[in-house]
Amino acid sequence: VLEVYYTSLRCRCVQESSVFIPRRFIDRIQILPRGNGCPRKEIIVWKKNKSIVCVDPQAEWIQRMMEVLRKRSSSTLPVPVFKRKIP
């Protein structure tokens, strides 16, 4: 599941990693766009082993993965991959 959240919270990520995470290990991805208290875009990945990590949005592998998920979400209706939550 890929999610985009708009919140008024400050930055969530303490440290970001560029280390590749194979898709089979990923349970969920959340994208927090910059603004609303945090000056940078944040990407949070929940792994299937019950750990959680912030991924550097500039990491090539996460950009490629998000592009694949975007394409998949636009072609598999009616269930959207993006969930926009606007408080």
């Epitope: 440290q15 944040e42 929940w46 082993n49 019950k50």
Partner: antibody, heavy 122, light 107 residues
Framework: QVTLKESGPGILQPSQTLSLTCTFS??????????VGWIRQPSGKGLEWLAN???????YYNPSLINRLTISKNTSNNQAFLKITNVDAPDTATYYC??????????????WGQGIMVTVSS | DIQMTQSPSSLSASLGDRITMTCQAS??????LIWFQQKPGKSPWPVIY???NLASGVPSRFSGSRSGSHYSLTISSLESEDMADYHC?????????FGSGTKLEIK
């Protein structure tokens, strides 16, 4: 607010099975990212992590005790359970349950119960 | 399993002193380390998470740092309410492991 409370027998005999219940409020184990863990502390000593159970029924155990531990939950009753088989004197300790929420920033065991003192004695 | 070696086991200091306690990890745990404070007869409570971040409501005299595999908790000016046991916890990987604890006493 988040609260947790442990319950179970205060005393039991060697070779018996210890059954502990954690009753909690302020969160639900049906919510994505929620978990409950069990930790114990012998009197005057350090903490020892025992087990975790997560919203999706994923379970993790301390390998040194894995053959004796069973963690489970009743989501609708807001309860988590821990069973320890074949107890002996070294299992005498205060047992705590604690919440973990898999969010960023991740702070496992951010809320704890008051603890329950368990004595194993013949 | 990752071993967490905590020192000293006990520490006696005067009010206003600067004190430091340490945990050493046997394997790489990144920044995934928490310090818990446990006051006498009470449950543990997080004071520092992700090695150096102050938990909500914790006074700014508490701080955490890392040097390689050594993780430190420092209290810059000791107050009487800081008398407690302190435990480190690594949560990089299962099984989660605690240090053996540091008992902080006031002289």
């Amino acid at each position: 607010q988040v609260t947790l409370k442990e319950s179970g027998p205060g005393i039991l005999q060697p070779s018996q099975t210890l059954s502990l219940t954690c009753t909690f409020s302020g969160f639900s184990l049906s919510t994505y990212g929620m978990g409950v863990g069990w930790i114990r502390q012998p009197s005057g000593k350090g903490l020892e992590w025992l087990a975790n159970i997560w919203w999706d029924d994923d379970k993790y155990y301390n390998p040194s005790l894995i053959n004796r531990l069973t963690i489970s939950k009743n989501t609708s009753n807001n309860q988590a359970f821990l069973k320890i088989t074949n107890v002996d004197a070294p299992d005498t300790a205060t047992y705590y349950c604690a919440r973990s929420e898999l969010v960023m920033p991740y702070v496992p065991f951010d809320f704890w119960g008051q603890g329950i003192m368990v004595t194993v004695s013949s | 399993d990752i071993q967490m070696t905590q020192s000293p086991s006990s520490l006696s200091a005067s009010l206003g002193d600067r004190i430091t306690m340490t945990c050493q990890a046997s394997q790489d745990i990144g920044i995934e380390l928490i310090w818990f404070q446990q006051k006498p007869g009470k449950s543990p409570w997080p004071v520092i998470y992700y090695t150096a971040n102050l938990a909500s409501g914790v006074p700014s005299r508490f701080s955490g740092s890392r040097s390689g595999s050594h993780y430190s908790l420092t209290i810059s000016s000791l107050e009487s309410e800081d008398m407690a046991d302190y435990h480190c916890l690594q949560y990089k990987q299962y099984p989660f492991t605690f240090g053996s604890g540091t008992k902080l006493e006031i002289k």
